[in-house]
């Protein structure tokens, strides 16, 4: 087959700009051009055939994957039909999953379907764009391709391209999506975003406020802890590092660190600036009064493990 | 452009068949599936299978399979449908279509081809 | 099979009016539906593909939408020329099926 236009080189894959209107090819036949440059008519599935799950051998069939049915090869097959895949498998359907392939990525634009062909891939092009990878616009302005009240600028003419200018919530060459503005995560403080549409608002956590609940309510400013605490802020709260021997939200209540009796063995609890002390009974020793003293002067401490030597500190759970 | 022409209707007698043809132009006819439909009146639209002519490979409704059968002449770029068997349930107008070429769905149709089955 | 439900046989409607279409699955085929109107004594005629797109020379005010199991056809700005029965199409799964159909009628 030779080539038609708008596309040059051996193969048909590189595009030239048409010097009119672009001529639509015939089926089966990628935009080409010159006659001189000689190419294989490329396979081109069935429109609308899965470019993940499909692929064919002949122009205009769908054939599917294992896995995979349906005119289009769009419909899982249930786990019963493959009983016995070849190749690697899925763990969800247990059928034979596809190794990377031309279409991944998808490299058509604006839209298209891509199908992969024994050489390379083939893009099925929307109504309204041609070319190897539907990059090239045959839609003028007169054709009303901006959506959602999108203006459209440009495209008088056949050859030149449109801009459609899209109005707030909206993106896309033709304004066709909708903008996630929630994807660029507004609301502050892990306030949940949402999208009404005309507006964003964020429902805002306890102890936040404000239109991106960017207002700590719970923060320290204007908060004193008593009794020399220091103010913490976290988790949307604060929170105060209250002294030794004070206690409570604001360190107003007075804490007895002797009143757990956190001494053993009748050892007595003193309450000392830098913590409690216990002055142990006799014949006990250890922070906490914890250890009996031996007679013969050895403390029952417990053995160490191995790679460490008694003396060494330990912590025992 | 895409263009399908469907033979002339037919009166048959139960028990007889029918073959209806549809000659495409306009076209690669091995390239697109040809899809066969029918219709009477109440019961809309039916999907009886489609062929592709380049390969000859055919889809079948359940419910036809052993009433419709399907062939395809490259040569002279037709589309064929025989009905075998025929009862009053097959009187209907029968329509063949065509694949699109980069949309999906059935773009273009015959006129159709009204077959009625009485004694 | 799938079954596509148009629940309303009959839609009555005036020129210059905005009327929906709708269509049912009975299971989720995506978008893989089409539409296509027809008029007394002629073949049908495709207006819309992959549930919103419109077939080469369908007029603007033919616009579609939908995905999954539930899609509607709406006619904007109703003409004269757009009275006739449109039916809905799924090309998911074999076999294909089609919806019983609804005519638009005039008030």
């Known amino acids: 087959a030779r080539c038609e236009p708008p596309a040059v080189g051996t193969a048909c894959t590189r595009l030239c700009r048409p010097r009119s209107a672009p001529s639509r090819c015939g089926p089966g036949l990628r935009p080409c051009a010159p006659l001189e440059d000689e190419c294989e008519a490329p396979l081109v599935c069935r429109a609308g055939c899965s470019p993940e799950h499909g692929f064919c051998e002949q122009p205009g069939e769908c054939r599917c994957l294992e896995g995979w049915t349906g005119p289009l090869c769009t419909v899982p097959v249930s786990t019963s039909s493959c009983l016995s895949p070849r190749g690697p498998s899925s763990a969800t359907t247990g059928c034979l999953v596809p190794g990377p392939g031309p279409c991944d990525g998808n490299p058509c634009a604006n839209g298209g379907s891509c199908s992969e062909t024994p050489r390379s891939f083939e893009c099925t092009c929307p109504r309204g764009f041609y070319g190897l990878r539907c990059e090239v616009s045959g839609v003028t302005c007169a054709d009303g391709p901006c959506f959602n009240g999108g203006l459209c600028v440009g495209g008088a003419d056949p050859d030149s391209a449109y801009i459609c200018h899209c109005p707030p919530g909206f993106q896309g060459s033709n304004c066709e999506k909708r903008v996630d503005r929630c994807s660029l995560q507004p609301c502050r403080n892990g306030g949940l975003c949402l999208d009404l549409g005309h507006a964003l608002r964020c429902r805002c956590r306890a102890g936040f406020a404000g239109p991106r609940c960017e207002h700590d309510l719970d923060d320290c400013a204007g908060r004193a802890c008593a009794n020399g605490g220091t103010c913490v802020e976290g988790g949307g709260a604060h929170r105060c590092s209250c002294a030794l021997g004070f206690g409570g939200r604001d360190c107003r209540e007075r804490a007895d660190p002797c009143a757990a009796r956190p001494c053993a063995h009748g050892g007595r609890c003193y309450a000392h600036f830098s913590g409690l002390v216990c002055a142990c009974a006799p014949g006990y020793m250890g922070a906490r009064c914890e250890f009996p003293v031996h007679p013969d002067g050895a403390s029952a401490l417990p053995a160490a493990p191995p790679g460490l030597r008694p003396g060494d500190p330990q912590r025992y759970l | 452009q895409v263009q399908l022409q469907q033979s002339g209707g037919d009166l048959m007698k139960p028990g007889a068949s029918v073959k209806i043809s549809c000659k495409a132009a306009g076209y690669t006819f091995s390239n697109y599936y040809i899809e066969w439909v029918k219709q009477r009146p109440g019961h809309g639209l039916e999907w009886i299978g489609e062929?592709?002519?380049?390969?000859?490979?055919?889809t079948y409704n359940e419910k036809f399979k052993g009433k419709a059968s399907f062939t395809a002449d490259t040569s002279s770029n037709t589309a064929y449908m025989q009905l075998s068997s025929l009862t009053s349930e097959d009187s209907a107008v029968y329509y063949c279509a065509r694949w699109g070429a980069r949309e999906p769905g059935f773009p273009y149709w015959g006129q159709g081809t009204l077959v009625t089955v009485s004694a | 099979d799938i079954v596509m439900t148009q629940s309303q046989k009959f839609m009555s409607t005036s020129v210059g009016d905005r009327v929906s279409v709708t269509c049912k699955a009975s299971?989720?085929?995506?978008?893989?539906v089409a539409w296509y109107q027809q008029k007394p004594g002629q073949s049908p005629k495709a207006l819309i593909y992959s549930a919103s797109y419109r077939y080469s020379g369908v007029p603007d005010r033919f616009t579609g939408s939908g995905s999954g199991t539930d899609f509607t056809l709406t006619i904007s700005n109703v003409q004269s020329e757009d009275l006739a029965e449109y039916f809905c199409q799924q090309y998911n799964n074999y076999p294909l099926t089609f919806g019983a159909g609804t005519k638009l009628e005039l008030k």
């Open positions: 299971q989720n085929v995506g978008t893989n």
């Open positions: 062929i592709l002519p380049g390969s000859g490979s055919t």
